[in-house]
């Protein structure tokens, strides 16, 4: 049966046993800035092109054991959530991956900046259709990272990022705090904000909307046919990147403002239990859970 | 995220170092009264001191970025400091990434075309 997260973002009209938009997102290229990925995984094989871009810090610790499957874990799962054959949102979208996070999931602001610059240069050299950039990472507030995101957004690129897993105000983190970026918090199957131990999804006025981010089934780098469930605002952001890819594929001329407006318009409203958020953040945090447009757009979205 | 709001700095630390009249013999001194600012991550454990993104003013050309980077290296060398230019930015933001001692920040902030300097910091998978 359909995984809960795909059911949650699918309009009632399409809730059959399977989530099968045949060609969702085929006009769109999604760039993923994350860990290395297992590109020969059955879920994403032929859908993800691994670029030669790599800018990562050394791993921490004197006795760190580098295992390919662990190095690829985070990125492989997210690529699967965006465009995986069986468990992906935008099954028609093509992806390009840049490695900016090391085997321990750690990167740098400077490495991320150079990655964003690489995307801009690629866009200038070979203009294609609409571009979505997925940034499933967060650090402290960074003026320069936010500025780079702003410039890329003004060049017509849609940037989607994780709100952060710190149970804190997303405005204190980057790129989550960049106004031009679509910032995504995480909710669970009960439409509750996701708790991750003592921590959990970030919140506040820098979050644009929420999306499924707990127990999300996706490609596991343990083997080429393995699946695993992962949780976090990265998974939530991957859902929105997939939805954005489908919307842009249906309407390639959408501006960032129009796309943001559509994402909000088609979201489920007031379903999140706001009691989880600190009192002073409740009114500032959007009560929106991302969803695909309903059947009135059938000809556009499910061609 | 969330458009239509003023930029949020949060606990972001900003250190403003005023430019002085002494310009170290530079041909292109910055406009009178401007200040370049230094920024670093508010979360100390995520800071990466020793690597800095020097962001230049918006209309700065690549050749000017390269010249500014070389000038920083020359001035640092005169003071006995080694520096390494790791990357020159162009396409999104003009500027360069430099590995250097924090002792050189005051000097770097006085270079022509400099808008602000940010210390590198960590980001994490979410």
């Amino acid at each position: 049966s359909i995984p809960w997260n795909l059911e949650r973002i699918t309009p009632p009209r399409y809730r059959a046993d399977e989530y099968q938009p045949p060609d969702g997102g085929s006009l769109v290229e999604v760039y993923l800035l994350d860990t290395s990925i297992q590109s020969d995984h059955r879920e994403i094989e032929g859908r993800v092109m691994v670029t030669d871009f790599e800018n990562v810090p050394e791993e921490d610790g004197t006795r760190f054991h580098r295992q390919a499957s662990k190095c690829d874990s985070h990125g492989t799962h997210l690529a699967g959530v965006v465009s995986g054959r069986d468990a992906g949102v935008a099954k028609g979208a093509s992806m390009r991956s840049l490695r900016v996070l090391n085997c321990q999931g750690k990167g740098t602001v400077s490495g991320t900046l150079i990655g964003l610059e690489f995307i801009r240069k690629s866009q200038l050299v070979q203009p294609v259709g609409p571009l979505v950039v997925l940034l499933p990472l967060a650090g402290g507030y960074s003026r320069v990272l936010n500025a780079a995101c702003q410039r890329l957004a003004r060049a017509g690129v849609v940037l989607v990022t994780a709100a952060g897993n710190f149970r804190d105000d997303a405005c204190l983190y980057s790129p989550a705090s960049a106004p031009e970026v679509i910032t995504v918090g995480a909710t669970n199957a009960q439409d509750q904000p996701v708790t991750l131990g003592t921590l959990g999804t970030n919140f506040g006025r820098c979050v644009d909307l929420f999306a499924p981010g707990e127990d999300i089934i996706g490609a596991s780098s343990d083997c080429s046919t393995c699946f695993v469930s992962q949780s976090g605002t990265s998974q939530a952001a991957a859902h929105v990147a997939g939805i954005a890819a489908m919307m842009l594929s249906a309407e390639p001329e959408l501006t960032l403002a129009e796309l943001r407006q559509r994402l909000i318009h088609f979201s489920a409203k007031d379903v999140i239990n706001e009691a989880w958020f600190p009192e002073d953040q409740r009114v500032l945090t959007p009560n929106l859970v991302a969803a695909l447009p309903p059947s009135t757009h059938e000809n556009l979205y499910f061609q | 995220g969330a458009m239509g709001q003023e930029d949020e700095d949060g606990d972001y630390e900003e250190l403003v170092l005023a430019l002085r009249s002494e310009e170290d013999g530079l041909a292109e001194a910055p406009e009178h009264g401007t200040t370049a600012t230094f920024h670093r991550c508010a979360k100390d454990p995520w800071r990466l001191p020793g690597t800095y993104v020097v962001v230049l003013k918006e209309e700065t050309h690549l050749s000017q970025s390269e010249r500014t980077a070389r000038r920083l290296q020359a001035q640092a060398a005169r003071r006995g400091y080694l520096t390494k230019i790791l990357h020159v930015f162009h396409g999104l933001l003009p500027g360069f990434l430099v590995k250097m001692s924090g002792d050189l920040l005051e000097l770097a902030l006085k270079l022509p075309h400099v808008d602000y300097i940010e210390e590198d910091s960590s980001v994490f998978a979410q």
Partner: antibody, heavy 122, light 110 residues
Framework: QVQLVESGGGVVQPGRSLRLSCAAS????????MHWVRQAPGKGLEWVAL????????YYADSVKGRFTISRDNSKNTLYLQMNSLRAEDTAVYYC???????????????WGQGTTVTVSS | QSVLTQPPTVSAAPGQKVTISCSGS????????VSWYQQLPGTAPKLLIY???KRPSGIPDRFSGSKSGTSATLGITGLQTGDEADYYC???????????FGTGTRVTVL
């Protein structure tokens, strides 16, 4: 609910070995780093060891380095501490504790077990 | 020998405020996140504060944390008899590549 239960403590002679276990329940064990912390009778807390969520990195206090080994079996939701060449000064209550997060292991510990007592005596 | 120094005891009357200091160095408190733990008599420690000043859910706002340079402080306002316990600061030490706890402070309610 979230729970950590230590076992394997007991009385052991100096120079001998002991293996402690910590059974985790109520949370996704494989998503969190795990620590061992000990407390000698009437003394303060002393950190012993840390293992990352995927087992890829291990850290030890100088006082136990080379004698103790931390490990985990994510399929069994269990954390272990293999203690060799035990000394009288290793006598303590041993707690397992969950790291606040996988990547930000230096944040501290948010869930603690009730502890198991190890007595090293001849 | 702990690298984080705390006062052995602090005491105050019910309803009063107490502060506990934790002094370290640049390799620990100066550049790493500080947590505070409460250990009631005969029980396991419990997390009170993490990331210098954040409280886990269920911890009352009578407990607060702050950091300045290489020192951290735990504040307890509206002191109650149930607050009688040992309190420990803790942080990562980059030089030691390990976690370190403070020497511990016993809080007594007069």
């Amino acid at each position: 609910q979230v729970q950590l239960v230590e076992s394997g403590g007991g009385v052991v002679q100096p120079g001998r070995s002991l293996r402690l276990s910590c059974a985790a329940s109520g949370f996704t064990f494989s998503s969190f780093g795990m620590h061992w912390v000990r407390q000698a009778p009437g003394k303060g807390l002393e950190w012993v060891a840390l293992i990352w969520n995927d087992g890829s990195n291990k850290y030890y206090a100088d006082s136990v380095k080379g004698r103790f080994t931390i490990s985990r079996d994510n399929s069994k939701n269990t954390l272990y501490l293999q203690m060799n060449s035990l000394r009288a000064e290793d006598t303590a209550v041993y707690y397992c504790a969950r790291a606040i997060a996988a990547l930000y292991y230096y944040y501290g510990m948010d869930v603690w077990g009730q502890g198991t007592t190890v007595t090293v005596s001849s | 020998q702990s690298v984080l120094t705390q006062p052995p005891t602090v005491s105050a009357a019910p309803g009063q405020k107490v502060t506990i200091s934790c002094s370290g160095s640049s390799s620990n408190i100066g550049n790493n996140f500080v947590s505070w733990y409460q250990q009631l008599p005969g029980t396991a420690p419990k997390l009170l504060i993490y990331d210098y000043n954040k409280r886990p859910s269920g911890i009352p706002d009578r407990f607060s944390g702050s950091k300045s340079g290489t020192s951290a402080t735990l504040g307890i306002t509206g002191l109650q008899t149930g607050d009688e316990a040992d309190y420990y600061c803790g942080t990562w030490d980059s030089s030691l590549s390990g976690y370190v706890f403070g020497t511990g402070t016993r809080v007594t309610v007069l």
